[in-house]
């Protein structure tokens, strides 16, 4: 392991479409990938009239957008589907939305999802 870097070996797994996709609904996902490439966790969700609906959580392949991010934070302004990625085991358990362009308080607080 490289000093100062959180290696990702497992992530929280969730799939809202688990029946259609024939997967588990929730659990812990071991992250696989080329041995020299970095691995990350991700979370995707929707904001339906102020209610957070998780779409998917799991492992994410080597992505410079995720490097050295210990927290899962979406910074894009009002995307249709929110996405964040991070490094470190289970770092996608919590995710937040802090749009970069906002000057005022963020529109939503950090979320600790409770899958249905």
């Amino acid at each position: 392991a490289i000093l100062g870097r959180s290696e990702t070996q497992e992530c929280l797994f969730f799939n809202a479409n688990w029946e259609r996709d024939r997967t588990n609904q929730t659990g812990v996902e071991p992250c696989y990938g080329d041995k020299d490439k970095r691995r990350h966790c991700f979370a995707t969700w929707k904001n339906i009239s102020g209610s957070i609906e998780i779409v998917k959580q799991g492992c994410w392949l080597d992505d410079i957008n995720c490097y050295d991010r210990t927290d899962c934070i979406e910074k894009k302004d009002s995307p249709e589907v929110y996405f964040c990625c991070c490094e470190g085991n289970m770092c996608n358990e919590k995710f937040s939305y802090f749009p970069e362009m906002e000057v005022t308080q963020p529109t939503s607080n950090p979320v600790t999802p409770k899958p249905p």
Epitope: Y32, D34, K37, F42, T44, V55, K56, G58, C59, W60, L61, D62, D63, I64, N65, K76, P79, E80, V81, Y82, F83
Partner: antibody
Framework: QVQLVQSGAEVKKPGASVKVSCKAS????????INWVRQAPGQGLEWMGT????????SYAQKFQGRVTMTRDTSISTAYMELSRLRSDDTAVYYC????????WGQGTLVTVSS | QSALTQPASVSGSPGQSITISCTGT?????????VNWYQQHPGKAPKLMIY???KRESGVSNRFSGSKSGNTASLTISGLQAEDEADYYC???????????FGGGTKLTVL
């Protein structure tokens, strides 16, 4: 093993649209991006855009804005690239590639635009 | 984002070393370690050789190496072999906040 299998060659008339598919296997489709790249005959590689396979979020090269649409169907691990208002200079081999590093590539789809 | 600049062609004899350059700007090549190198044989899809400036892709010979100085990335192939004859492209990471761009390509001839 990771594989990206693309749809077959297409012949289109100027002004028409073409939709190329890219079916992924051997890895979790929703764990990365799919990028699209084209190569005109005897020319270099040209990046067209990318789609985040889990969120569906897209980024397109400025040159193709308004003419290209990238989508995906996670239930069948397939990404699509549709190019509209085709011109003769869109004749090229179109490739899909996995991830931000383009570490695996499809075999390519030849699109010929001719009247 | 403008294309990266590569020499149109380079050549070398078997056993020699050659270097292919890829010049960008301070905002792409110069500021981040996200340049990749691809090999393409005629009629085939490109193949990732080097990613993140200097990391060798799994299964790629250690005769291939990558480096960067300022706004220029370089691919060095040592101990040239006949099968190295191909087109080589540099390119950048693409996804999320990053837009992709490729160099114009360099034709390597093994004499």
């Amino acid at each position: 093993q990771v594989q990206l299998v693309q749809s077959g060659a297409e012949v289109k008339k100027p002004g028409a649209s073409v939709k190329v598919s890219c079916k992924a296997s051997g890895y979790t489709f929703t764990s990365s991006y799919i990028n699209w790249v084209r190569q005109a005959p005897g020319q270099g590689l040209e990046w067209m855009g990318t789609i985040n396979a889990v969120s569906g979020s897209t980024s397109y090269a400025q040159k193709f804005q308004g003419r290209v649409t990238m989508t995906r169907d996670t239930s069948i691990s397939t990404a699509y690239m549709e190019l509209s208002r085709l011109r003769s200079d869109d004749t090229a081999v179109y490739y899909c590639a996995r991830g931000g590093w383009f570490d695996y590539w499809g075999q390519g789809t030849l699109v010929t635009v001719s009247s | 984002q403008s294309a990266l600049t590569q020499p149109a062609s380079v050549s070398g004899s078997p056993g020699q070393s050659i270097t292919i350059s890829c010049t960008g700007t301070s905002s792409d090549v110069g500021s981040r370690n996200y340049v990749n190198w691809y090999q393409q044989h005629p009629g085939k899809a490109p193949k990732l050789m080097i990613y993140g400036v200097s990391k060798r892709e799994s299964g790629v010979s250690n005769r291939f190496s990558g480096s960067k100085s300022g706004n220029t990335a370089s691919l060095t192939i040592s101990g040239l072999q006949a099968e190295d004859e191909a087109d080589y492209y540099c390119g950048t990471f693409a996804g999320g906040d990053y837009y992709g761009v490729f160099g114009g390509g360099t034709k390597l001839t093994v004499l």
